[in-house]
């Protein structure tokens, strides 16, 4: 009776269940009634990183230092490379595929600290009360306008992305 | 594609003034946050002045409040930076900065050298 399921590390082909190329190589070949499954170790700059029947590796992330990306961690034959941004500059996501010198804050979000040398920006929701309608990386969140204070009556409530609107008190003849 | 010149750097004797400016283009030069970044020799990148879209809002760093002035021309689609009673901490490769700025975007920057 030909399998239907594999075990851990196995794959099922023409009826049979062949061994995974372990990480670091790739398949030559599957397995026969009578031979093993081949696996080749994948070559300079490739990398494959799970039990895997793959016929080609994965060429390693490049580090474009024209992007500002350097070299973190070097791949290797079962890793890929890990890139990070050069100094002072911050990575645009967690793949890290390009930098930039520093994070805005999105309208909604007021920043809270500037970015340093050594820490990006630092953003806050703005609290009721407040509001940001720009991206800035420097602006705080800035406080509804009183329209109290303008003798003037609220229109339109404020967010935390915009002010308020006055207008003028309706007079009672 | 983002492009950035700056010019107006040179040698100046402390205590006197420069003015910097970048000219900008391959965006939408009044929508954007617009900032001053500074590399000493052998130091990190240090964020001098920002300036909002409108020209309303700025921010100074405290090494140079007082002392540099940020403002932008929009019909001109350009960005300055009024240097006054400078010093020679102030020496740096100034470049000009869109925000999000991106590696990618640098300008060549403009070399200001304070030195008696």
């Known amino acids: 009776e030909p399998p239907t399921a594999c075990r851990e590390k196995q794959y099922l082909i023409n009826s049979q269940c062949c061994s995974l190329c372990q990480p670091g190589q790739k398949l030559v070949s599957d397995c026969t009634e009578f031979t093993e499954t081949e696996c080749l170790p994948c070559g300079e700059s490739e990398f494959l990183d799970t039990w895997n029947r793959e016929t080609h590796c994965h060429q390693h992330k490049y580090c474009d230092p024209n992007l500002g990306l350097r070299v973190q961690q070097k791949g290797t034959s079962e890793t890929d490379t890990i890139c990070t941004c050069e100094e002072g500059w911050h990575c645009t996501s967690e793949a890290c595929e390009s930098c930039v010198l520093h994070r805005s804050c999105s309208p909604g979000f007021g920043v809270k600290q500037i970015a340093t040398g050594v820490s990006d920006t630092i953003c806050e929701p703005c609290p009721v009360g407040f509001f940001s309608n720009v991206s800035s990386a420097f602006e705080k969140c800035h406080p509804w306008t009183s329209c109290e204070t303008k003798d003037l009556v609220v229109q339109q409530a404020g967010t935390n992305k915009t002010d308020v609107v006055c207008g003028p008190q309706d007079r009672l003849r | 594609e983002v492009q950035l010149l700056e010019s107006g750097g040179g040698l100046v004797q402390p205590g006197g003034s420069l003015r910097l400016s970048c000219a900008a283009s391959g965006f939408t030069f009044r929508d954007y946050e617009m900032w001053w970044v500074r590399q000493a020799p052998g130091k990190g990148l240090e964020r001098v002045s920002a300036?909002?879209?409108?020209?309303?809002?700025?921010y100074y760093a405290d090494s140079v409040k007082g002392r540099f002035t940020i403002s932008r021309d929009n019909s001109k689609n350009t960005l300055y930076l009024q240097m006054n009673s400078l010093r020679a901490e102030d020496t740096a490769v100034y470049y000009c900065?869109?925000?999000?700025?991106?590696?990618?975007?640098r300008g060549q920057g403009t070399l200001v050298t304070v030195s008696s």
């Open positions: 300036i909002n879209p409108q020209g309303t809002r700025t």
């Open positions: 900065a869109k925000l999000p700025f991106r590696f990618s975007d």
